[in-house]
């Protein structure tokens, strides 16, 4: 069926529209376009004869139309009047006619809107503000934005006049925001510039800071006043009711007891005409001088030097107090106080002794603290650590190694590869590594103050393929029901999967088995003798899969309660007594015997030939495992009948 599609359907004034013909019949004689929903010679726009390829304008032709051989009609420089229906009349070669009608709508391009306001400086909790979006345009939709968000739901916000007017009732300071309006029609959308609402408010009750109301003689008094206000408040200070100055801050140096009294701050807003005041009462006390600390060694060396800290000045009949890290002095053989507590000596300082240290002088009013003193303890360098801990890297990646050694002052670093100095930096970076970058990487840390140096060497292998792994253990002989064992699969490599097997089987589910560190570490908590099995780790990356040799866990256990055999307890006189003691234990236990409490021999077997009734009594076997530190025993009664 012949159809007309308008592209686009909604057309902006001045743009163009294409009336696109679908399913045009074969074997045509020609076609004509008409304005309107029917064929009307007075409203013909253009006709086209296929045989001559001749286009003939009609009465409704405006000079803006172009007809195409496929019957589509392009109308350029569209005007409002072009809105409506268009009919295509097709004459086939057999002179049978066909018609189809299409339509489009024309809309104006909207101008950029602007916002007008009925009140440029509304007062908080009093005024209302009405914003209107200009100009008024037919067939346009109006939208509003507050701080680039759509309007919040609020009973104080009201839209009217077809959403063209936004009214804010009873404005608050929180309404101070960026307001924009937007006009939309089917062919355009325009947004206004921002209008910032300037709400007048305050002053609120002023706050005086600091809150401190007690001061010592000789200190500076520096009070600051602040009240929320728009426009900003004007401030005035009164002391004991007498005006002092019109400033936000009040500064009185080197105060005395005479400066005690009531201090009032008054805040005034010239636009709202409102005043608010706040009063604080200041008390000034007479005080002794502030103490301070002197040191006999400002840069002590760790584990070598002692430091004596003295609290100054020396005042008779005064109690001296000391604090370290804001705590009272800890009990330590390395901390010594002089008889009058005025001197604190630190013997053989460590890096943890940096402080801060404070001393205090106690008087009837309070404790007067010195300023804190921090010790600059020189130490290190410790053995440097190279990170990350990977030892295997695949070719093509970047190698980025960082070295760190605890040191004061901070260490200076050097890197060597296979013994050759590379650079004097904390970090070593090599891009796009190859197998030729395999080698020994040494980080050297040097402390310029102590002159000490320490080095760490790391072997780095560059290979796409991983080596056969190995298992390291943190405990080669764990004790049953006491120790944990952590197995780690070496080496550590990037982009590598780690797997574990026990006795050739995948790991059993057990709360005592835990995988961590990306499955590289297998921890067995509270080992038992049943954990003495073969452990294997496997590693897998993009090109390799390898298993370690098995590691058998040697769990130390026992000794369990021993068993004495044979179980017989009655013997005939003249028989041989041959008792054997056995206890499950790893390693094998040491055995000893006691008869009626008297030690006999340190053997597993007790042999007595030709026993008599004199051999009646209690036979005790004692077992001892030196590795686990555990002991056990059992007692058996033997009766010999005549």
């Amino acid at each position: 069926k012949l159809t007309i599609e308008s592209t686009p359907f909604n057309v902006a004034e001045g743009k163009e529209v294409l009336l696109l013909v679908h399913n045009l019949p074969q074997h045509l004689f020609g076609y004509s376009w008409y304005k309107g929903e029917r064929v009307d010679g007075n409203r013909q726009i253009i006709g086209y004869v296929i045989g001559t390829q001749q286009a003939t304008p009609g009465p409704a032709y405006s000079g803006r139309e172009i007809i195409y051989p496929n019957a589509s009609l392009l109308i350029q420089n569209i005007i409002q009047n072009d809105t409506g229906f268009y009919t295509l009349h097709v004459i086939k070669s057999d002179l049978v006619n066909e018609e189809a009608t299409g339509q489009f709508r024309v809309y104006p391009e909207l101008p950029k809107p602007s916002i007008s306001s009925n009140n440029s400086k509304p007062v908080e909790d009093k005024d209302a503000v009405a914003f209107t979006c200009e100009p008024e345009t037919q067939d346009a939709t109006y939208l509003w934005w507050v701080n680039n968000q759509s309007l919040p739901v609020s009973p104080r916000l009201q839209l009217s006049n077809g959403n063209r007017t936004l009214t804010l009732f009873n404005v608050t300071r929180n309404d101070t925001a960026s307001y924009k309006c937007e006009t939309q029609n089917p062919v355009s959308a325009r947004r206004s510039d921002s209008v910032i609402l300037n709400v007048l408010y305050g002053p609120d009750a002023p706050t005086i800071s600091p809150l401190n109301t007690s001061y010592r003689s000789g200190e500076n008094l520096n009070l600051s006043c602040h009240a929320a206000s728009n426009p900003p408040a004007q401030y005035s200070w009164f002391v004991n009711g007498t005006f002092q100055q019109s400033t936000q801050e009040l500064f009185i140096p080197n105060i005395t007891v005479n400066n005690s009294g009531s201090y009032t701050c008054q805040a005034h807003n010239s636009d709202t005409g409102l005043n608010r005041t706040t009063v604080t009462t200041i008390t000034v006390y007479a005080e002794p001088p502030k103490p301070f600390i002197t040191s006999n060694n400002s840069n002590p060396v760790e584990d070598e030097d002692a430091v004596a800290l003295t609290c100054e000045p020396e005042i008779q009949n005064t109690t001296y107090l000391w604090w370290v890290n804001n705590q009272s002095l800890p009990v330590s053989p390395r901390l010594q106080l002089s008889n009058d507590n005025r001197t604190l000596t630190l013997l053989s300082v460590t890096r943890n002794d940096v402080g801060p240290y404070e001393c205090g002088i106690q008087n009837e009013l309070s404790v007067d603290h010195s300023d804190p003193v921090i010790l600059n303890v020189l130490y290190g360098p410790d053995d440097p650590t190279i990170s990350p801990s990977y030892t295997y890297y695949r070719p093509g990646v970047n190698l980025s190694l960082s070295c760190h050694a605890a040191s004061n002052p901070p260490a200076q670093y050097s890197w060597l590869i296979d013994g050759n100095i590379q650079q004097h930096t904390q970090e070593l970076f090599i891009s796009n590594i190859t197998e030729k970058n395999s080698g020994l990487y040494t980080c050297q840390a040097n402390n310029s103050a102590s002159g000490h140096s320490r080095t760490t060497v790391k072997t780095i292998t560059v290979s796409a393929e991983l080596p056969k792994p190995s298992i390291s253990s943190n405990n080669s002989k764990p004790v049953e029901d006491k120790d944990a064992v952590a197995f780690t699969c070496e080496p550590e490599a990037q982009n590598t999967t780690y797997l574990w097997w026990v006795n050739g089987q995948s790991l059993p589910v057990s709360p005592r088995l835990q995988l961590s560190n990306g499955n590289r570490t297998l921890t067995l908590f509270n080992v038992t003798r049943n954990d003495a099995r073969a452990y294997v780790c496997g590693i897998q990356n993009s090109v390799s899969a390898n298993r370690s040799d098995p590691v058998t866990l040697d769990v130390l256990y026992g000794p369990d309660t021993p068993i004495i055999s044979p179980p017989d307890s009655s013997y005939l006189s003249g028989a041989n007594l041959n008792l054997s003691c056995h206890s499950a234990s790893n390693p094998s236990p040491q055995y000893s015997w006691r008869i009626n409490g008297i030690p006999q021999q340190h053997t597993q077997v007790l042999f007595i030939a030709k026993i008599t009734p004199n051999n009646n009594g209690t036979y005790a076997c004692f077992v001892s495992n030196l590795a686990t530190g555990r002991n056990n025993s059992i007692v058996k009664s033997i009766t010999v009948s005549a």
């Epitope: 093509g396 197998e435 393929e465 050739g504």
Partner: antibody, heavy 120, light 106 residues
Framework: EVQLQQSGAELVRSGASVKLSCTAS????????MHWVKQRPEQGLEWIAW????????EYAPKFRGKATLTADSSSNTAYLHLSSLTSEDTAVYYC?????????????WGQGTSVAVSS | DIELTQSPAIMSASPGEKVTITCSAS?????MHWFQQKPGTSPKLWIY???NLASGVPARFSGSGSGTSYSLTISRMEAEDAATYYC?????????FGAGTKLEIK
Amino acid sequence: EVQLQQSGAELVRSGASVKLSCTASGFNIKDNYMHWVKQRPEQGLEWIAWIDPENGDTEYAPKFRGKATLTADSSSNTAYLHLSSLTSEDTAVYYCHVLIYAGYLAMDYWGQGTSVAVSS
Amino acid sequence: DIELTQSPAIMSASPGEKVTITCSASSSVTYMHWFQQKPGTSPKLWIYSTSNLASGVPARFSGSGSGTSYSLTISRMEAEDAATYYCQQRSTYPLTFGAGTKLEIK
């Protein structure tokens, strides 16, 4: 049972491109790296590249950069090899293969191969 | 790229005979891997990480070597061993294969 099933033989025109598939069963391709290998008629084996289907990471032999593109779809457990601008040099059998731990043993599984013939 | 040179390119052996195929690398590699391929079939991993036999490989096969020189040995040749054997290195990218050794039965 672990299996790699490759798509059927392709006859393509010179200059065109082709996309070969390799569908895995018996394991999850996200857990392993998938490799592709080329074997020209009566010739040896050439490694093309691998892909980590979990994150799309790839490593290509320099010779095949720009020629081969590896992708994977975890939902269908399938890896793909896309070959572009084909010439007679690309006439070969293409294999996918994967190295995985099957229980305690490291196993290497190969697809049956896809034959690509390029006609002028 | 690391080049792998296999020798011989082609050889025949009688049943029971000892066979050694060598693979020489242009640079040192961590391990060498060996694949077996029979006509019309996919390659099979035969020996991995220089000396480990893949699952199902007869014990008459062995692998050895280090650095740049590696070999695959069959202690006693059998008819089913006739195939093409490829060595492969995975130490550095690109991964490379040897050109192959075609082993025939006499």
